[in-house]
């Protein structure tokens, strides 16, 4: 039998054993997240298994989502959602010591397929573990890419109250329109559920002590949420290690100074 | 000094009504979200009501419900629940609290938990 | 509404350690806060956010959390720490505060 011809892409292919990855943190998740203990987590793996294979990777969709992300409905409180750019590991550690703020990760969805990679072909039942599109060599509408944008919008769409974003001071855009908060959840923030945003920018250097807050891509943010009718607000996170700390444990006495 | 100061406990009949008030002292009222507990006689501590700082959302517990409306007058550094429809089983000692919240590098943080307590006020509902 | 089960009363030695539990249906991201009530007292809260310990508690009192449990430690067991000790959580789904039923701690 002749090896029949794969699409060659860009990108790595789909993270070893897939399916058993997502199935597994999907009963992990449910088992310690009891509001969503009525969740069946072979229908999930159906659902997210229907939405990128026999499809050609470079044409998925939104709407393939949908189910996945019916089934993955969950709401945060009010007051609770954080956003990051750029700064993923530390806005998780954060809410690692802050339990009660939730990223995209620490929901089910985005808890599933964080770090991951996938992608099937068109017409075979087939996982593509040699290769998948990367989003700028091959193609935007490619599974990974369009998961994300459709969860981003979707947490984004649910927020309410003040909604929190960590941004990375140390980039030389600190707002990007382009990344995933600048281009999909800034503009699916609901006016109506949203008071304010306040975003905190997280310093790099030890001894930056400008305020960050007055960057001309910050002034931008500003500008974009304003215009929305949401207000914003701005805040300087200088040493984001002793932030981690004093998050912890607020009462330590070097945490009792406004440093 | 950080305390809180409770009043307008008493004794009143059963389907009557009755207002408590609690008073904060030396913390910024208006920053703090604020809580009324109660304790029976004999008994344990039993969650009422709980109030945004701003007094924008109010929570309550299944008991009191319809029955009761927690409120506050920042202005006034001043907490207060309106008890309707008393029954037998409201008789207890009522205690307001502020919940605990810090800012952590200008970042204010709910702590889930009781910080300050008042020294309570007693309301006996009995004919 | 998730319960929170405590044992109803323990009972130790000046010197001894003893341990209070609390368990129930907690949710990983609520945490457990735990308030000592002296005989004709208001509350006292004695840790915070499962493990923590505001300034002027003593660091005999300590606090732990495994999954869907929680105690409260207290060494060198001295006899002002006859008292009743709750433990509590918020709720950050359902709004609600959630408190045990109470320990009653013995001095012998």
């Known amino acids: 039998v002749l090896p029949r011809w794969r699409q060659q892409w860009s990108g790595s292919g789909t993270t070893s054993r897939f399916p058993e990855t997502v199935l597994a943190r999907c009963v992990k998740y449910t088992e310690v997240h009891p509001e969503m203990r009525h969740v069946d987590c072979q229908s999930v793996w159906d659902a997210f298994k229907g939405a990128f294979i026999s499809k050609y990777p470079c044409n998925i969709t939104e709407e393939d989502y949908q189910p996945l992300v019916k089934l993955g409905t969950q709401t945060v409180p009010c007051n609770k959602t954080l956003l990051w750019s750029r700064i993923k590991d530390l806005a998780h550690q954060f809410t690692q010591v802050q339990r009660d703020m939730f990223t995209l990760e620490d929901m089910l969805l985005g808890y599933l397929a964080d770090d991951l990679t996938w992608c099937g072909e068109f017409n075979t039942f087939e996982i593509n573990y040699q290769s998948c599109p990367d989003w700028r060599k091959d193609c935007s509408n490619n599974p990974v890419s369009v998961f994300w944008k459709t969860v981003s919008r979707r947490f984004a769409e649910t927020a309410c109250g003040v909604v929190h974003v960590m941004l990375n001071g140390s980039r030389s855009k600190i707002f990007d329109k382009n990344s995933t908060f600048g281009s999909v959840e800034v503009h699916n923030l609901q006016p109506e559920k949203v008071q304010a945003l306040e975003a905190w920018v997280i310093h790099g250097g030890r001894e930056d002590s400008r305020d960050l807050c007055q960057d001309p891509t910050i002034k931008e943010l500003e500008s974009i949420i304003s215009k929305r009718n949401i207000r914003f607000f701005c805040k300087n996170i200088y040493r984001p290690d002793k932030f981690l700390q004093c998050v912890k444990n607020p009462e330590d006495s070097s945490c009792l100074s406004g440093i | 000094e950080v305390q809180l100061l409770e009043s307008g406990g008493g004794l009143v009949q059963p389907g009557g009504s009755l207002r408590l008030s609690c008073t904060g002292f030396?913390?910024?009222?208006?920053?703090?979200?604020m809580s009324w507990v109660r304790q029976a006689p004999g008994k344990g501590l039993e969650w009422v009501a709980d109030?945004?700082?701003?007094?924008?959302?109010?929570y309550y517990a299944d008991s009191v419900k319809g029955r009761f409306t927690i409120s506050r007058d920042n202005s006034a550094n001043t907490l207060y629940v309106q008890m309707n429809s008393l029954r037998a089983e409201d008789t207890a000692v009522y205690y307001c609290?502020?919940?605990?919240?810090?800012?952590?590098?200008?970042?204010?943080?709910?702590?889930?938990?009781?910080?300050?307590w008042g020294q309570g006020t007693t309301v006996t509902v009995s004919s | 509404q998730s319960v929170l089960t405590q044992t109803p009363s323990v009972s130790g030695t000046p010197g001894q350690r003893v341990t209070i539990s609390c368990s129930g249906v907690?949710?990983?991201?609520?945490?457990v806060s735990w308030y000592q009530q002296l005989p004709g007292t208001a509350p006292k809260l004695l840790i915070f956010?499962?493990?923590q310990r505001p300034s002027g508690v003593p660091d005999r009192f300590s606090g732990s959390r495994s999954g869907t449990s929680a105690s409260l430690a207290i060494s060198g067991l001295q006899s002002e720490d006859e008292a009743d000790y709750y433990c509590?959580?918020?709720?950050?789904?359902?709004?609600?505060?959630?408190f045990g039923g109470g320990t009653k701690l013995t001095v012998l």
């Open positions: 609290a502020k919940r605990m919240e810090r800012e952590v590098m200008t970042i204010k943080l709910d702590y889930h938990a009781m910080d300050v």
């Open positions: 030396g913390f910024t009222f208006t920053d703090a979200r």
């Open positions: 109030i945004s700082s701003y007094g924008d959302n109010t």
């Open positions: 907690f949710n990983i991201r609520n945490y």
């Open positions: 956010k499962d493990d």
């Open positions: 509590a959580a918020w709720d950050i789904f359902l709004n609600v505060w959630v």
